[in-house]
C-alpha cells in the first residue's frame, strides 16, 4: 500500500501493485538475464496439483537506469520481470532451451510480482544542482497466482501487498548545501 | 490510503522544548523520506529538513541546525520532530511530509500547531 | 538563499476562466520547481513538480510551465474548488525555499 499513490509521472517507472512490468525498450542500458530463479517445491501430481504453491514462474532480471526530470541515477538499479508461463516447478526449465514448458488445461495461472523492495539511489542532475536521492520501488520476486473465472484483471490489484522491506545497508549522505556540489557520490548498492 | 497523522496542537513556554509526532499508516516510512515544513501567517511556508528512516539520514535548512532535530523510529512507523529553546517565532503550523524524493513533498499531514507563550 | 517572488498576492478570477500564476527565482533553478496548492483550514497538496509534471491525481486542467527564472502555473477552466492558496518552491539547491504564496479568488 501507499506505493500505488507514489506513482511517478516522470520518466522513471515505478510499478504498482498487480502490475506485471515489461523491460520497456527505451530504458537505457537494458540488460536482460534469462535465469529462472524462481525454484518451488516439486508437485506430487506433476499434472494435477491443486496447490498454488507448487507452481512456478520466470524472474527475468534487468537492469536500468533510474530517472527523473533531468536526473539520472549514478549507477543502474535491477530488478525483476515477473514473465513466463506458471506450471509444476520440477517441470520448468533451467536454463533457456532446457526442460518441456508444461501448459495448463485447466485454470489460468498467472506469473505476478509477489514482494517489493524499496531502494534509495543517488541521482546526477546537470548543472550541479544539489545532490538528490529518491527511493524507487522495485520488484523482489514473483509468484504464481491462481485465477479462476470469477477473477478478471483488475482483481489483480488487491495481489502482491506484502510490504516491501528493503535490505539494511549504509547509503551515501547527500551533503551539500550550495548549487556547486559535487554529486559523484554513488549509492552503495543492495 | 497513504496518511499522516500528526500529534495534536502544544502551548508551550518560552525556552521550553516539545517533541511532534508524525504517524504514518498505509506506507511503511522506511521507503519514503519524511520531511517538515513551517508555517506561518506572514512568512509563508518553510523547509526544515528530511529524514531517512531507513538509516538515520538527515539534511536540515541552515536555519534550523541546532533549533530542530528529526528522528524516526521505524518499528511504530513515526517520525519526531523536536524543537528547542523555543520563542514566539516558533509560533507555527508544523507538516509533516512524506515523499518518494528528497527534494518535493508528495503527502503531508494535516500539522501541528505550536503555540509559544512567555 | 533563493529567493521566490510571487508578486501576485492575490489574483481574481471566475469560474470557467484561464489563470496563470507566475513565480520568480531569484537565480537560475533550471526546471527544480515545484508547485502546491493549500485550501483554507488545509495542508497543502502537490500540484506540478519539475517545473512542469503533474502529481498523480491533478487535474489536467492545471498546467506548469517555464525554467530558469520564470515559472507559470495555468489553471484553465477554472472550477469553484480552485479557490486558494498556491506556492512555487525550488529545488535546486538548499535549503530549498518556497513563495510567498498567490491567493486565487472569486471576482
Known amino acids: 500500500q501507499g506505493w500505488q499513490a507514489f506513482k511517478n509521472d516522470a520518466t522513471e517507472i515505478i510499478p504498482e501493485l498487480g502490475e506485471y512490468p515489461e523491460p520497456p525498450p527505451e530504458l537505457e542500458n537494458n540488460k536482460t538475464m534469462n535465469r529462472a530463479e524462481n525454484g518451488g517445491r516439486p508437485p506430487h501430481h506433476p499434472f494435477e496439483t491443486k496447490d498454488v504453491s507448487e507452481y512456478s514462474c520466470r524472474e527475468l532480471h534487468f537492469t536500468r537506469y533510474v530517472t527523473d526530470g533531468p536526473c539520472r541515477s549514478a549507477k543502474p538499479v535491477t530488478e525483476l520481470v515477473c514473465s513466463g508461463q506458471c506450471g509444476p516447478a520440477r517441470l520448468l526449465p533451467n536454463a533457456i532451451g532446457r526442460g518441456k514448458w508444461w501448459r495448463p488445461s485447466g485454470p489460468d495461472f498467472r506469473c505476478i510480482p509477489d514482494r517489493y523492495r524499496a531502494q534509495r539511489v543517488q541521482l546526477l542532475c546537470p548543472g550541479g544542482e544539489a545532490p538528490r536521492a529518491r527511493k524507487v520501488r522495485l520488484v523482489a520476486s514473483c509468484k504464481c497466482k491462481r485465477l479462476t473465472r470469477f477473477h478478471n484483471q483488475s482483481e489483480l490489484k488487491d495481489f502482491g501487498t506484502e510490504a516491501a522491506r528493503p535490505q539494511k545497508g549504509r547509503k551515501p549522505r547527500p551533503r551539500a548545501r550550495s548549487a556547486k556540489a559535487n554529486q559523484a557520490e554513488l549509492e552503495n548498492a543492495y | 490510503e497513504v496518511q499522516l497523522q500528526q500529534s495534536g496542537a502544544e502551548l508551550v513556554r518560552s525556552g521550553a522544548s516539545v517533541k511532534l509526532s508524525c504517524t504514518a499508516s498505509?506506507?511503511?516510512?522506511?521507503?519514503?523520506?519524511m520531511h517538515w515544513v513551517k508555517q506561518r501567517p506572514e512568512q509563508g511556508l518553510e523547509w526544515i529538513g528530511w529524514?531517512?528512516?531507513?538509516?538515520?539520514?538527515?539534511e536540515y535548512a541552515p536555519k534550523f541546525q541546532g533549533k530542530a532535530t528529526m528522528t524516526a523510529d521505524t518499528s511504530s512507523n513515526t517520525a519526531y520532530l523536536q524543537l528547542s529553546s523555543l520563542t514566539s517565532e516558533d509560533t507555527a503550523v508544523y507538516y509533516c511530509n512524506a515523499g518518494q524524493a528528497t527534494y518535493y513533498f508528495d503527502y503531508w499531514g494535516q500539522g501541528t500547531t505550536v503555540t509559544v507563550s512567555s | 538563499d533563493i529567493v521566490m517572488t510571487q508578486s501576485h498576492k492575490f489574483m481574481s478570477t471566475s469560474v470557467g476562466d484561464r489563470v496563470s500564476i507566475t513565480c520568480k527565482a531569484s537565480?537560475?533553478?533550471?526546471?527544480?520547481v515545484a508547485w502546491y496548492q493549500q485550501k483554507p483550514g488545509q495542508s497543502p497538496k502537490l500540484l506540478i513538480y519539475?517545473?512542469?509534471t503533474r502529481h498523480t491525481g491533478v487535474p489536467d486542467r492545471f498546467t506548469g510551465s517555464g525554467s530558469g527564472t520564470d515559472f507559470t502555473l495555468t489553471i484553465s477552466n477554472v472550477q469553484s474548488e480552485d479557490l486558494a492558496d498556491y506556492f512555487c518552491?525550488?529545488?535546486?539547491?538548499?535549503?530549498?525555499?518556497f513563495g510567498g504564496g498567490t491567493k486565487l479568488e472569486l471576482k
Open positions: 537565480q537560475d533553478v533550471g526546471t527544480a
Open positions: 529524514i531517512d528512516p531507513e538509516n538515520g539520514d538527515t
Open positions: 518552491q525550488q529545488y535546486s539547491s538548499y535549503p530549498y525555499t
Open positions: 519539475w517545473a512542469s
Open positions: 498505509g506506507f511503511n516510512i522506511k521507503d519514503y523520506f
